[in-house]
Structures are given as structure tokens and as C-alpha cells.
Interface confidence: low
Amino acid sequence: NQDLPVIKCVLINHKNNDSSVGKSSSYPMVSESPEDLGCALRPQSSGTVYEAAAVEVDVSASITLQVLVDAPGNISCLWVFKHSSLNCQPHFDLQNRGVVSMVILKMTETQAGEYLLFIQSEATNYTILFTVSIRNTLLYTLRRPYFRKMENQDALVCISESVPEPIVEWVLCDSQGESCKEESPAVVKKEEKVLHELFGTDIRCCARNELGRECTRLFTIDLNQTPQTTLPQLFLKVGEPLWIRCKAVHVNHGFGLTWELENKALEEGNYFEMSTYSTNRTMIRILFAFVSSVARNDTGYYTCSSSKHPSQSALVTIVEKGFINATNSSEDYEIDQYEEFCFSVRFKAYPQIRCTWTFSRKSFPCEQKGLDNGYSISKFCNHKHQPGEYIFHAENDDAQFTKMFTLNIRRKPQVLAEASASQASCFSDGYPLPSWTWKKCSDKSPNCTEEITEGVWNRKANRKVFGQWVSSSTLNMSEAIKGFLVKCCAYNSLGTSCETILLNSPGPFPFIQDNIS
């Protein structure tokens, strides 16, 4: 039908820099290049209906749905969404096309649905339909990678059963300890699933997708290294694959490696060996012990023996369910205002945990470090000397763990005062929690030394937002003190602060702060 207008529907993705909700406008934002949504005429529909390609948006993303109409004359339009009817302001671009926009800022579940645009032009009427949905990250998964032996080859395949399909990479390092940190120049990354070079010191496989990154280290016993003071321990869940690599270097090829479980040789088919010469002509041998799907009876001491090296063992523990072992009793700390201090949690967990530190409803990233004894530790130092409650939360696929910490900062009280017609109150958050005195200033006591004991009520309250204690003292006003200046003083082991209040008849109350060390 040649009377039909030429319609173009586009999606513009924005880099978020605003927090309001959907607007029908041409709202200025930092934008990506527009994506054509097709806008085909819907077949077999009564009336003229154009349908744009479905739009999938990430939660909190900002987008603009835009329609460009190549039709003569003026156009009028109306957006309809759920209960909403939004008038729209069409404008014209440099090519004299009508432009109608719907801006959705910070996409939420409530803004997902069908957006209908009714357009009237001088020539005809038509409807344009946009379907906007939130990308279903609920179906997304990111599973820790595991290893398989490649059929008929001495190579390992790294597998991560994740949605969307993850990018798999091997992270290799030939140094020891600290120099094998992720961004170290000693680290080599290979974005492939199969690894043939299995002689390196440290071998990890990582999988990443929209949900993040998960890594698995190839558990290794190196017979040329001094054994750890505590026996290395490897945890696995029933059904997971077991892989342990034993590595040894010798001046020549005249040595062999064997694996034993609880003093019994591993069955054939549960191990394979590889060897190579290094640049200095020494022989490197590696012997893999593997079980494709572990059962409870695979638990035990796995010992790698060599004819030329002292043997070393590892304890493999097969569990039905993951766990997080740590003491969850709450801990209270008291530090000086400029003292360096970190919270720390020591735990043993399998599978590896995801964790956060939280203070005042704000979450902070959580780093964990493996210790030699099979434990891990997470530290939090970024408290900026703010007193209150700090929460460590950890979870893995099977377990959750929460630990509370209270931080108290030793400091001199600071006093705030407020007054009403019937009482005066003073507040302080110094630590240790202060004690209070009230004094009356009069002709008889110009230095305000006359103590008031009647009508005083002290209490401590938890300022919930930060989990921080605040002490307060209230003086009920009596005829005896009305019209006088009174002084409330808070004192602890670090000093004293006072505030002077004029107890007028109802009206504004001036306060004079008075700090005494």
C-alpha cells in the first residue's frame, strides 16, 4: 500500500547517568549508536500495526524507543503502557521526518511490557508495538570449572556448565607464591578449552560470563618443594571429578612416580603420566591421579612416591554437601581514633565462598586469601574509623554464614543539645559512653558549679543506622530553673564536653558549646 508511511523503529542504549523513570521525550543522555528494530507490518491484523523487534534490556539500563515517520504533514501521537497513557511530543529531524521518543531510565520489572504508540498523520492512522523485557538473568548460572582428560591425548579440557556460554581461559604461572598473582607479568593466559602444556608450576582454569568469573586450581603436589607444615587438604562433593597432579624434577630420567590411596596403588585408568626435558636437561615428570566422579569411599590420604624424592601426601575429603566453617560469635573492638585496624574472618569452606562486608546498609567488596593450613582469611580495613556494626556475609552453593562485628572508637564526648518548653536534652556519642552532670548558672554560681540532680533522666540508645550507641540526658524543667542558664556536661576517660542552654519560656533556645579536655 503506497499510502502507508515509511516507518523506522530504533533502540538507543544509554550509559546510565540519571535515576528518574520513563519519560516521553527526546531526553539528552550519553548514547550508544542506535539499533534498528525493523518495524515490520504485522500480518493479518485489523488496522495498520507495525511491530518492532523485541527489546531485551538489562536491569537498571537506560534506553530510548524511537520511531521515525516519513509521512507528509503534521502527526499527533499517544503512548500507551499498562495503565499509563503518556502524551508524546513529536518533533521533526533535519530530513523532515517525524520523531517520537520514549525514554526509559533505569529499567525495572515494572517498566517491562508492551509499549503501544498510536500515531495519527494527515494520511493515515497506525499503531506501533514495542515489547520490552528484562533480560532474564535468573536463568543465568556460572559454575566453577572442572577438568576432564581429552580422549586419546595427554591434555586437559576445562569445562564450565554455565549460562550464557562462558569464555574459558587457562591461567598459567611458572613462578612461586606471590609472583603468581593475577596481574603479574609471570602469568600467562590462554583463551582456550584444551591445555597441552601441563608441566607449569601453577595451573588454573577460569570461566567468565555476565555473572562474573570462577576459577579452579589444578591441585598439585611438588616433590621438589619442602612439604607444608600441615598436610594439604582437598575437599570435593560427591559426584565431582578429582584431579591431583604430582610433579617432580630430577637430573636424569632414572626415576618413577606412583600414586597410592591409603597404601594401595591406584587402579589403572585412574592415573596417567607425562614427562619432558627442561632447558637445563633435567627431566620433569608429572603423574595425574583422577576419578571422573567421586564417591564417599574415595576419601583418604593420596600419597605420591618417587624413587628419587621423599614422598608427599594430601588428604582428600569427600562431602555430601558444601560447608562454611568459622566461628560466628560476634566480636567487639575498641580502637583509638588513628589506630590502624582490620576486621578479619578465618574460615574453611567448600566450594569457595562469595562474600561481602556491610556497614550502614552499604556493601563493600570482599577479598579472600588462602592460608597454608587449608583455611582462608578475609580482611576488611576500609572502616574509615566509623564506629558501629560491621557484618561479614559469606555463601556458597550449599551454605551461608554471617558474622557481626562492633567497632567502637575511643574519643572524647561531643555534646549536642535541644530543648522544648518542658525539658532540655543533651546527646553524645563519645566512647566509652559518657556520664552526665547538669549544673545551674546563677548569681550564686556564676561559674555554673551548682549541681542539678532533680529531674535528670539518663539513657543510652542504639542509633540503628550505624549500630552505634548514643548516650542522652534529659532535664525536666521545674519552676526553680526556668529562665536560668544550665550546663550539661558529658565526660569519659578521654575528656569532657559541655553545652550551655538558656531555659526560657517557650521559644527559641540558644546553645553555647563549651569543650573542656
Epitope: 504485522r42 491484523s45 485489523s46 488496522g47 500495526v49 511491530e51 500507551v80 503502557f81 499498562k82 495503565h83 499509563s84 497513557s85 503518556l86 508492551e114 503501544l116 498510536f118 499503531t127 508495538l129
Partner: nanobody, 110 residues
Framework: QVQLQESGGGLVQAGGSLRLSCAAS???????MVWCRQAPGKQRELVAA???????LYADSLKGRFSISQDNAKNTVLLLMNSLKPEDTAVYYC?????WGRGTKVTVSS
């Protein structure tokens, strides 16, 4: 298959009232629906719709005379038209989710 079926149109004298009904089948919710009309020789125009605060939106010329409502249990959108004028003569359509009904004819005689 989505179907919108208008009913309730007919011949009425100026000043009279009519109640139009739009039954929706194959459609999840009537929240999306709008009443439009097309008078002979004129463009189709918006009559009434729902607003974002759960209220209603009307063409300026119809305010106070027309009222849109919905019966979610029956998946029906209603248009109550009072104090009808000859210029309200038109085919009234309900539309929603990219679909249009066939319309119901309203004739207001003077």
C-alpha cells in the same frame, strides 16, 4: 488469537446516553486498551484511555461527558457516553496491544 469485539452502538437522540462495551479475548489484560473513534470523512481520534496513576485520559472535547472503565474479571472495557451530541456520530473502536476491533457505529440524531 486476540480478538476485540465492540458492542452497544446504535441510534440515539441528542442529549441521550449509550454504553459501549469492548470484550477482549486471547488477551492478558485490558489495562492496555484505548477507545478511539472515526467520524465520516475524518481521521481516527483518541476518545479515552487509562493514565499512569490509575486515572483516565479523555479528548478535551469529551471531558465530563464520557467515562472509561474496565471489568478485569470479564476482560471488558466500557465507555459510558452521556449528553451525546450530533458531532459524536462516528464508528467507535477499541484498540490495544496492536489490535483493533471492527468498531461499533454510534449515530446521534438532532
Amino acid at each position: 488469537q486476540v480478538q476485540l469485539q465492540e458492542s452497544g452502538g446504535g441510534l440515539v437522540q441528542a442529549g441521550g446516553s449509550l454504553r459501549l462495551s469492548c470484550a477482549a479475548s486471547g488477551i492478558f489484560s485490558t489495562n492496555y486498551m484505548v477507545w478511539c473513534r472515526q467520524a465520516p470523512g475524518k481521521q481516527r481520534e483518541l476518545v479515552a484511555a487509562f493514565t499512569n496513576d490509575g486515572g483516565t485520559l479523555y479528548a478535551d472535547s469529551l471531558k465530563g461527558r464520557f467515562s472509561i472503565s474496565q471489568d478485569n474479571a470479564k476482560n471488558t472495557v466500557l465507555l459510558l457516553m452521556n449528553s451525546l451530541k450530533p458531532e459524536d456520530t462516528a464508528v467507535y473502536y477499541c484498540c490495544g496491544l496492536g489490535h483493533w476491533g471492527r468498531g461499533t457505529k454510534v449515530t446521534v440524531s438532532s
